[in-house]
């Protein structure tokens, strides 16, 4: 019996589902009652899944496998493996028996992408050519082990003093930390590239070292004094300008935008050309305005993670730089109010009122007050939790003894937007239910 499987390994991302294809050619008159199908681990022979006596015998492998029952009669013996883990990697054998039998093995290759590397520089202040610095590149939770490459701004490999360590967690995912010790040139870019050899995925970051002190006659670079406030998901313009001298041409301009604290490269314009975004492909210059001295940076689809200081570095013959702060904000939702207990309430009862407001940034200030606007500061517990995007949910709980009647208001303030979102509950004198029934 000829059993067919793919020659190439099946590549599956951690956490996703994978299909291990396997097929046979059923003869005319074939019925499932004749079929014995066994999936097993090739090396240990551990049973994974089976079909026998006309019935799916189910998963013997952590309840994460399934056949395609509607397709079996057509010769499709493929196996679905759910929520793939690193531990699943290896060879699976598909064994098919009708009158004759046959088998074939298919390889599962598991992979997980590495995170965008973080770059740190030590020391990171008052750097001068000739100083020795340590640059650390860290990337997280990938599989299999990464290949790490360092290069300078011209793409020349830096193979000198590099130490790379990789650590695996209980799930088998690796963190990689690579440390480069280098003597600074006059100025330069140092890039770290973390490659996933299976996915052929490259995650990279760069730091750019710019001169710290300028001679007299420095280029005057102007940025706004106040932080630029941008709502999550919108675009922001970080304004930066310089005064070009008569006869200035873009061929003379070196413009570098970088993160102020880590020196990570964000965007650059050199040798008369826009060198593009080094920051998640979400940045752009204003090319038509550069010749007039407008070096502003457009940052698209702002995220909480973008918050911080960005330095605009302009070099023509002399150079100058200035930093502009980006303050990210997101409005809080209208609070939802819940009351416990919420039935047959009477004056003198102790109730718990919960005020919940969602997906704001930065952390909120929460105020409780009664119907007369008098603050209620007594028994209040407020907790804030950030999600993966950095947006906060706020839950504030007030425990209060009911008066004859009264209103209890919760105000959630966004300190950056000066936006107030409020909700309230009103308790009447009669026994009542909350929310009031229609």
């Amino acid at each position: 019996l000829e059993v067919q499987v793919p020659e190439d390994p099946v590549v599956a991302l951690v956490g996703t589902d994978a299909t291990l294809c396997c097929s046979f050619s059923p003869e005319p008159g074939f019925s499932l009652a004749q079929l014995n199908l066994i999936w097993q681990l090739t090396d240990t022979k551990q049973l994974v899944h089976s079909f026998a006596e006309g019935q799916d015998q189910g998963s013997a492998y952590a309840n994460r496998t399934a056949l395609f029952p509607d397709l079996l009669a057509q010769g499709n013996a493929s196996l679905r493996l759910q929520r793939v883990r690193v531990a699943d990697e290896g060879s699976f054998t598909c064994f098919v028996s009708i009158r004759d039998f046959g088998s074939a093995a298919v390889s599962l290759q598991v992979a997980a992408p590495y995170s965008k590397p973080s770059m740190t520089l030590e020391p990171n202040k008052d750097l001068r050519p000739g100083d020795t610095v340590t640059i650390t590149c860290s990337s997280y939770q990938g599989y299999p082990e990464a290949e790490v490459f360092w290069q300078d701004g011209q793409g020349v490999p830096l193979t000198g003093n590099v130490t790379t360590s990789q650590m695996a967690n209980e799930q088998g995912l690796f963190d990689v930390h690579s440390i480069l010790r280098v003597v600074l040139g006059a100025n330069g870019t140092y890039s770290c590239l973390v490659r996933n050899p299976v996915l052929q995925q490259d995650a990279h970051s760069s730091v750019t070292i710019t001169p710290q002190r300028s001679p007299t006659g420095a280029v005057e670079v102007q940025v706004p004094e106040d932080p630029v406030v941008a709502l999550v998901g919108t675009d922001a313009t970080l304004r930066c300008s310089f005064s070009p001298e008569p006869g200035f041409s873009l061929a003379q301009l070196n413009l570098i935008w970088q993160l102020t604290d880590t020196k990570q490269l964000v965007h650059s314009f050199t040798e008369g050309r826009d060198q593009g975004s080094a920051y998640a492909n979400r940045t752009a210059l204003f090319p038509d305005l550069l010749a007039q001295g407008n070096a502003s940076l457009r940052l698209q689809r702002v995220r909480v993670a973008d918050e911080g200081s960005f330095t605009c570095f302009v070099s023509i013959r002399d150079f100058g730089s200035a930093a502009v702060s980006l303050q990210v904000a997101a409005p809080y939702s209208k609070p939802s109010m819940t009351l416990e207990p919420n039935k047959d309430l009477r004056p003198g009862d102790t109730v718990t009122i919960t005020c919940s407001s969602y997906r704001g940034y930065p952390e909120a200030e929460v105020f409780w007050q009664d119907g007369q606007g008098v603050p209620l500061t007594g028994n209040v517990t407020t907790s804030q939790m950030a999600n993966e995007q950095g947006l906060f949910d706020v839950h504030s709980v007030l425990r209060v003894v009911l008066g004859a009647n009264g209103t209890y208001s919760c105000l959630v303030r966004n300190p950056v937007l000066q936006q107030d979102a409020h909700g309230s509950v009103t308790i009447t004198g009669q026994p009542m239910t909350f929310p009031p029934e229609a």
């Epitope: 995170s115 967690n169 963190d175």
Partner: nanobody
């Protein structure tokens, strides 16, 4: 900018225990991968343990089963519980914070751990 302040270092005998703390400024602590590195005299800095923002942890082979990293997001603090200390654990221990999404990274100033009889 995130500021990191380590504490809890000191001198201890072989087999003893220490607990290091690293307090971070800033309101998005839960977004950071928090790591402990160490640097022994004359050696390169090396990673010891990491607490990911998603809750999983990684350890260097040399400390597995002896060191435990944990974090308290409410207190913006990461800890390193070090048990069964050995002479070769003597080093300056540094705290590192790496943002899980934007590539920003920060170091603390370090705290010295000395293991000697």
């Amino acid at each position: 900018e995130v500021q990191l302040v380590e504490s809890g270092g000191g001198e201890v005998q072989p087999g003893g225990s220490l607990r290091l703390s690293c307090a971070a400024s800033g309101s998005t602590f839960s977004m950071y991968h928090m790591s402990w590195f160490r640097q022994a005299p004359g050696k390169q800095r090396e990673p010891v343990a990491t607490s990911h923002h998603g809750g999983t942890t990684n350890y260097a082979e040399s400390v597995k089963g002896r060191f435990t990293i944990s974090r308290d997001n409410a207190k913006n603090t990461v800890y390193l519980q070090m048990n069964s200390l050995r002479a070769e654990d003597t080093a300056v221990y540094y705290c590192k914070a790496d943002h899980g999404y934007n590539g920003r990274g920060y170091w603390g100033q370090g705290t010295l751990v000395t293991v000697k009889p």
